[in-house]
């Protein structure tokens, strides 16, 4: 009875007492048939949601309640009485301490402490039987019955539904007898429920509904397995394609067997030559948790071809929570020589199965949608790479993803697959022993795909230097080294200590590559970020330049006229961030096509005019080339005395 | 490529949107109370109370009989007429607050919000598999009832729970009513009481035992009686009430009250706090 942890649900909404069935009695550690008080509790008067479910159900065995009350009386009335223990019920009677009667007077010899009302000092604590699984449901009515050895809670809800649920504490899901709507009004089901024979009467709005205790029917069970696993008292049987009671389909009703049911299979295609490991999904395959299949009971065919059952790999067996139901069956498909390319059916037939706990499995299930295909390899790129391996090969073709296994072999060694799609395979080459041309092949389902390809192992690229040691987004970086073109791409990466950004260098010269810096945002427009700039080619060892400075990109000003005063022989213009990158990239300033020996003063650029320069009537274009990218910033003009431009 | 079957949720094996049509009865108004009766000779009935009316249904939910229980003061009120001529209190609608079976007789007892919360006794008359109600008896003796002491004032307009217990040849009504100051001032219903039905069905015996919320707490301390039942040697009431008379009245908890079903007295009235929790 001591309070426990957890979220309190202090407000009782509805209650009912009933004798319990064997299973729940065991869980409550009481005898079967003992009376238990069941209550639906909420967090507050409005019943609104807090964290956790809207309604919870607690079970209080009556004998335990009585024992707790009697113990409370003993604590109050038998000496030694704990000092300060109150009799309670101060709203009904005068306050007093045990063992005194209400009021101030002490016990007289002919009155007993036990002859006065008492609030027992300890409470009786219980946790939600449903473990929070009622979730958003707001229960408004409750009636508990015992059916066979099962205890069933019949609950009405705020939205006018009836939930008939087995009362068990040990599961992580609700075992429904039914869950249905009483009508279209959606009005709350009222608190008082009555029983009449094998029916319960619920009221909702202005209506009274008569609900069978064993549930309204079986049609809500969608699968044969679920149907025949229903409680015996529900009287459910399988009628070919639906679950029903015998009166609903007397001709086809049976409780004896279920056919297997294929719901899905994988893969949906396989090679015409070579094997495929086919996984069938569904229910009622073998009803054995270990996945053992009795000999000769399961026959799988795909088109004309048989699929040989495989023993379940025990390492792959995963515990299936009963709330999820799915069975897996694996078989090895080896197409017959007569098998044609194209779509076909997957068929599972189960016969001669021993009966299970609820039913035996017997029958056939067919599912469309498997296709036999012929993989074709059309192109491989690149056909060379460093001896170190790590080259990302792209194999292009058709039906490359069919089946369950494929391998790209480079000189007999597997090329590790990184991506598989119908038209493309990507894999990383293994290291090669020497510089040589070696065979490259593709196997699907263990069979070789036609075509003859060779891969050339080349000397490993060696990066010797990276320059300059600074730059900005997309600015050029020169990588020098040897055999740089042995790799399909060099990768340039900048790491600031927290994150890395990459760009791919275009394959150019064997000893020199011009790359562009990757996308990297320098937050502070006045600052820069130091980090490591690395270059690597496929799986070969890379080169790292520490202390690389990543700068914000310079921003050219908007183009306009640059008027010169008569006495001026140099032009000044602002170019934000240009001075900062002067050490990192080539900068060329020309006026009228002639170069000027520019200088930087902060963000100002000073360009002395070449003596040979002739400024015509329209002036001369001022062009700045930064890292090979040129912008015309405006035209240099010399205004006349009246402000009109004039030539010099 | 270790592909595994996608887990089919357990819920996919059933469809709770399937429509089921179950027998029903339209009462013509919001159902206020309902009780069922099953006799020894295969006769059964469902009694359904709505405002100002009591329906008697057969086991097939077809209407067998209908009785006007209000409005009080209305000439068509069939139960009111059982109390004789003359005004018996302020006129008004009758909301049924109590609808119980007295298994000893057997009889149906209904008590409403009108006429000081008095009750009416309807003897059950089997007719084949159905049941009819005999003419109602008014469980109210005017000369026994005063505003400060009214054994026949049973039902509170705020809600009343009743459990009937047979002790020897007598029927005892274990009554629990929600009170406030206004209700308490009119014909003094009690919070918890045990009342013996008089043998002549003229009302309840005076001098009954009772507990009531003390006048000083009536304004702030309200008790809602959610459920009552009888099992073994006890009658139990379940309440929702403030956790303390002194603290915040909106801080509620649930209690179980236990009364002896064998001794019609309240000395061994006990309460126990029921604590229900969700432990994720």
């Amino acid at each position: 009875g001591a309070p426990e942890g957890g979220q309190p649900y202090p407000v009782l909404r509805v209650a009912h007492s009933a004798p319990v069935g064997a299973q729940l009695a065991t869980e409550l550690s009481i005898a079967e048939g003992q009376e238990v008080l069941f209550g639906v509790f909420v967090t507050g008067k409005d019943g609104g949601p807090g964290v956790g479910p809207n309604s919870v159900v607690c079970a209080f065995p009556i004998d335990l309640l009585d024992t707790l009350i009697d113990e409370g009386v003993e604590r109050c009335c038998e000496s030694p009485v704990h000092p300060g223990l109150r009799r309670g019920l101060d709203f009904f009677q005068s306050p007093s301490f045990c063992p005194n009667p209400p009021g101030l007077e002490a016990l007289s010899p002919n009155t007993s402490c036990r002859h006065f009302p008492l609030l027992v000092s300890s409470s009786f604590s219980r946790v939600d039987l449903f473990n929070g699984l009622l979730g958003p449901v707001q229960v408004t009515a409750l009636y508990v019955t015992r059916l066979d050895n099962v205890t069933v809670a019949h609950m009405g809800t705020m939205d006018g539904r009836i939930l008939q649920v087995e009362l068990v504490r040990s599961l992580n899901y609700l075992l429904y007898v039914s869950n249905f709507s009483l009508g279209d009004s959606g009005q709350p089901v009222q608190r008082d429920v009555s029983r009449l024979g094998d029916h319960l009467l619920f009221a909702s709005g202005d209506q009274v509904f008569q609900v069978p205790i064993q549930g309204p029917g079986c049609r809500h069970f969608l699968t044969c397995g679920r149907c025949l696993r229903a409680w015996h008292f529900m009287g459910c049987g399988w009628c070919g394609n639906m679950c029903g009671q015998q009166k609903e389909c007397p001709g086809s009703w049976q409780q004896d067997h279920c056919p297997p049911k294929l719901t899905e299979f994988h893969p949906h295609s396989g090679p015409l030559r070579g094997s495929t490991r086919l996984t069938l999904c569904g229910s009622n395959f073998y009803l054995h948790p270990s996945g053992l299949v009795p000999e000769g009971t399961h026959q799988v065919t795909v088109g004309q071809s048989p699929c040989r059952p495989l023993p379940k790999d025990s390492s792959k067996l995963r515990p299936v929570p009963r709330k999820d139901f799915v069975e897996e069956f694996e078989c090895e498909l080896e197409p017959l020589g007569t098998q044609a390319v194209g779509p076909t059916n997957v068929s599972l037939t189960v016969t001669n199965m021993p009966p299970g706990k609820h039913f035996r499995v017997d029958g056939t299930s067919v599912l469309r949608g498997f296709s036999f295909m012929e993989p074709v390899l059309i192109a491989v790129q690149p056909l060379f790479g460093p001896r170190a391996g790590g080259t990302c090969l792209t194999l292009e073709g058709q039906s490359l993803s069919v089946g369950t296994s494929r391998a790209v072999l480079v000189n007999g060694t597997e090329c590790l697959l990184a991506r598989v799609s119908e038209g493309q395979l990507l894999c990383a080459t293994p290291p090669g022993a020497t510089v040589a041309s070696v065979p490259l092949s593709l196997q699907v389902g263990g069979a070789q795909v036609p075509g003859s390809w060779t891969f050339q192992y080349r000397e490993d690229p060696v990066v010797l230097s990276i320059s300059p040691n600074c730059g900005y987004i997309n600015s050029h970086i020169t990588i020098c080294g040897q055999h740089l073109t042995s790799a399909w791409h060099l990768v340039l990466s900048f790491h600031d200590g927290l994150r890395a950004v990459e760009s791919r260098c275009e394959r150019q010269l064997p000893e020199q590559q011009l790359c562009r810096l990757p996308e990297y945002v320098v937050r502070d427009p006045q600052g820069w970020v130091a980090g490591n700039l690395s270059a690597r080619g496929d799986g070969a060892a890379g080169f790292t330049l520490p202390g690389f400075r990543f700068l914000p990109p310079p921003h050219p000003p908007s183009a306009n006229l640059v008027p010169l005063k008569p006495e001026e022989h140099a032009i000044k213009f602002e170019y934000i961030g240009l001075g900062a990158v002067a050490d990192c990239v080539g900068i060329n300033v020309t006026v009228g096509g002639e170069s000027c020996q520019h200088e930087f003063r902060g963000d100002m650029v000073v360009c002395p005019l070449p003596p040979s320069l002739q400024l015509g009537q329209d002036g001369a274009p001022l062009q700045v080339c930064v890292d090979g990218e040129c912008h015309i910033l405006g035209r240099v003009v010399r205004p006349g005395p009246d402000g009109v431009p004039q030539s010099t | 490529e270790d592909w595994q079957c996608p887990r089919t949720p357990y819920a996919a094996s059933r469809d709770f949107d399937v429509k089921y049509v179950v027998p029903s009865f339209s009462a013509g108004g919001l159902v206020q109370a309902m009780v069922t009766y099953e006799g020894d000779r295969n006769e059964s009935a469902v009694f359904v109370a709505i405002r100002n009316r009591l329906h008697v249904l057969g086991p097939d939910l077809k209407s067998v009989q209908s009785l006007a229980t209000g409005p009080a003061g209305d000439p068509g009120c069939q139960t009111c007429a059982a109390c004789g001529p003359g005004p018996h209190g302020p006129p008004g609608d009758t909301d049924t607050k109590v609808l119980v079976l007295d298994p000893a007789l057997p009889a149906l007892v209904s008590c409403g919000s009108s006429l000081q919360g008095r009750c009416f006794l309807h003897d059950l008359e089997p007719q084949g598999t159905a049941v009819h109600l005999a003419a109602p008896a008014c469980l109210f003796s005017a000369h026994h009832n005063r505003p400060d002491d009214c054994p026949d004032c049973v039902a509170s307009p705020l809600g009343t729970r009743v459990t009937v217990v047979e002790q020897g040849q007598a029927s005892y009504f274990y009554v629990a009513s929600s009170l406030d100051a206004a209700v308490a001032a009119s014909f003094s219903p009690r919070s918890v009481s045990i009342r013996r039905l008089k043998a002549d069905a003229s009302g309840f015996a005076p001098g009954f035992v009772a507990l009531s919320v003390l006048p000083k707490h009536l304004v702030s301390y309200s008790i809602e009686y959610v459920h009552s039942f009888h099992t073994g040697a006890f009658v139990y009431f379940l309440t929702v009430q403030p956790a303390s008379v002194t603290d915040d009245p909106s801080a509620l908890h649930t209690r179980l009250a236990r009364l002896s079903a064998t001794e019609p007295e309240l000395g061994d009235y006990r309460e126990l706090v029921l604590d229900c929790r969700f432990a994720p």
Epitope: T485, E506, R507, Q508, L509, P510, E511 | -
Partner: antibody, heavy 117, light 106 residues
């Protein structure tokens, strides 16, 4: 079989611009780079620039301001554009495919360009 | 820029004579490639990666060298070998050619 075919004007007036097209077959411009080389009459070979498979260009710095190389992968065509031609730009202009091992393996037949008024 | 110098602009040799022409680089290069150009035709790749003969090149030709010094050798001159031979480096920007050595028949 790899082939490079060139087309362009024979005669260009001084200060005018030159445009030559090199159409390739037998390989894809998305896989290989194409270079331009010229040879003045009776003289040696001079590398002008390149457009790589991904579209990156590199130029001989002496000619950078006047030179532009572009391409249309879908048409398998590479374009050379040179501005402000002078008489010393008179030469045979070749396009050549590059093997990535550091050499040109296949050359176009060349386009004769004469700069004269 | 890497400057390739072919010191002998013109050389002549009699049929059957051994011919060696040189190419020196202003800074070290890993490989040198040789092109043969006959009058009014496009250059042809003749020797690549310093010593490997291009497809269709007679076996009397050979190439050697490393670092700054490279050479092309014809073990036995033949009339069809009359052409201009250019050395070339294509490993670093800007790509550069030697001025060429014109080989004539004596």
């Amino acid at each position: 079989q790899v082939k490079l075919q060139q087309s362009g004007p024979g005669l260009v007036a001084p200060s005018q611009s030159l445009s030559i097209t090199c159409t390739v077959s037998g390989f894809s411009l998305t896989s290989y780079g194409v270079h331009w080389v010229r040879q003045p009459p009776g003289k040696g070979l001079e590398w002008l620039g390149v457009i790589w498979a991904g579209g990156t260009t590199n130029y001989n710095s002496a000619l950078m301001s006047r030179l532009s190389i572009s391409k249309d992968n879908s048409k398998s065509q590479v374009f050379l554009k040179m501005n402000s031609l002078q008489t010393d730009d008179t030469a045979m202009y070749y396009c050549a495919s590059y093997d990535y091992d550091g050499y040109f393996d296949v050359w176009g037949a060349g386009t004769t360009v004469t700069v004269s008024s | 820029d890497i400057v390739l110098t072919q010191t002998t602009a013109i050389m002549s040799a009699s049929p059957g004579e051994k011919v060696t022409m040189t190419c020196s680089a202003s800074s070290s290069v890993s490989y040198i490639h040789w092109y043969q150009q006959k009058s009014s035709t496009s250059p042809k790749l003749w020797i690549y990666d310093t010593s490997k003969l291009a497809s269709g090149v007679p076996g009397r030709f050979s190439g050697s060298g490393s670092g700054n010094s490279y050479s092309l050798t014809i073990s036995s001159m033949e009339a069809e070998d009359v052409a201009t031979y250019y050395c070339f480096q294509g490993n670093k920007y800007p790509l550069t050619f030697g001025a060429g050595t014109k080989l004539e028949l004596k």
